[in-house]
């Protein structure tokens, strides 16, 4: 297991929410990506292929997510100060072998300007 800080901008703020970007190498074809807040699994997305190369995408923990050919984005809405924490992208690579797990993350700072509904 590889632990490290994300070497890219992991948090993208918009409209009182945040897009958390979890990248994976282009070569990875089948994987599970989990978003962890501290040690708690917030979201996950699994991409696999069957024996006829049919692709299946499944989410056990429901979050709004978006898959591209080298990243999974998880979206959190209605931000408040309780969202401030360490967030980790936990990537399990099934294909290509060998099986490998990598963990990258960063701290989500919440500033007043990023909150959804500020009191005037």
């Amino acid at each position: 297991e590889i632990n490290g800080s994300a070497n890219y901008e992991m948090f993208i703020f918009h409209n009182g929410g945040v897009q958390i970007l979890c990248k994976y190498p282009d070569i990875v074809q089948q994987f599970k990506m989990q978003l962890l807040k501290g040690g708690q699994i917030l979201c996950d997305l699994t991409k696999t292929k069957g024996s006829g190369n049919t692709v299946s995408i499944k989410s056990l923990k429901f979050c709004h997510s978006q898959l591209s050919n080298n990243s999974v984005s998880f979206f959190l809405y209605n931000l408040d100060h309780s969202h401030a924490n360490y967030y980790f992208c936990n990537l399990s690579i099934f294909d290509p072998p060998p099986f490998k797990v990598t963990l990258t993350g960063g701290y989500l700072h919440i500033y007043e300007s990023q909150l959804c509904c500020q009191l005037k």
Epitope: Q29, T48, K49, G50, T54, F94
Partner: antibody, heavy 117, light 111 residues
Framework: EVQLVESGGGLVQPGGSLRLSCAAS????????MDWVRQAPGKGLVWVSN????????NFAPSVKGRFTISRDNAKNTLYLQMNSLRAEDTAVYYC??????????WGQGTLVTVSS | DIVMTQSPDSLAVSLGERATINCKSS??????????LIWYQQKPGQPPKLLIF???TRETGVPDRFSGSGSGTDFTLTISSLQAEDVAVYYC?????????FGPGTKVDIK
């Protein structure tokens, strides 16, 4: 240790039905696509059907489409193959196989289905 | 559907000698740098056993006398030094598209 145990085979008349079961153990069943592969006596391997983790995606060989249905019960770690309108050419050993992301990495011992009058 | 063919249908090789099995697909199995081609061994009365995946990657625990090669439409399984326990039927299989299909098999015996 991964184990797949098929059951439900037997002798059936043409036009009849059978339901095969495959009990899985030793791995997280819901993490894997599962398949049925058959082998007629003295012949080669023929893929029959597969199903994704939660049963949302299903594929069949053209020769069985419309007659066979595949399903799974993840709570019971069991894969099923419902075979209707059976024909003599469906006579075979039916294997349950785990698709390990890039190959069939585990197989059951098989169950023999004989279609004959 | 992709059609898989194998040659020869059968072969007999002396113990310790090399056995070579060929597999041909009706269209290329190469995608994203990977050949979607698998080799299995099946002994009498037993289910198939995985030997090689992605055309050339040996499954864990498979003896290194088994090797796979080839790309695109032409593939080879080589047993570098045949042992008595290698007597079996060998099948290739593609998983490039649905339906996945198997070759007809090659029977390997001792000469």
């Amino acid at each position: 240790e991964v184990q797949l145990v098929e059951s439900g085979g037997g002798l059936v008349q043409p036009g009849g039905s059978l339901r095969l079961s495959c009990a899985a153990s030793g791995f997280t069943f819901s993490d894997y696509w599962m398949d049925w592969v058959r082998q007629a006596p003295g012949k080669g391997l023929v893929w029959v059907s597969n199903i994704d983790h939660d049963g949302n995606i299903i594929n069949f060989a053209p020769s069985v489409k419309g007659r066979f249905t595949i399903s799974r019960d993840n709570a019971k770690n069991t894969l099923y193959l419902q075979m209707n309108s059976l024909r003599a050419e469906d006579t075979a050993v039916y294997y349950c196989a785990r698709w390990g992301h890039y190959a069939f990495d585990s197989w059951g011992q098989g169950t023999l289905v004989t279609v004959s009058s | 559907d992709i059609v898989m063919t194998q040659s020869p249908d059968s072969l007999a090789v002396s113990l310790g000698e090399r056995a070579t099995i060929n597999c041909k697909s009706s269209q290329s199995l190469l995608s994203s740098g990977y050949n979607y081609l698998i080799w299995y061994q099946q002994k009498p009365g037993q289910p198939p056993k995985l030997l090689i995946f992605y055309a050339s990657t040996r499954e864990t625990g498979v003896p290194d006398r088994f090797s796979g090669s080839g790309s695109g439409t032409d593939f080879t399984l080589t047993i570098s030094s045949l042992q008595a326990e290698d007597v079996a039927v060998y099948y290739c299989q593609h998983h490039y598209s649905s339906p996945p299909t198997f070759g007809p098999g090659t029977k390997v015996d001792i000469k």
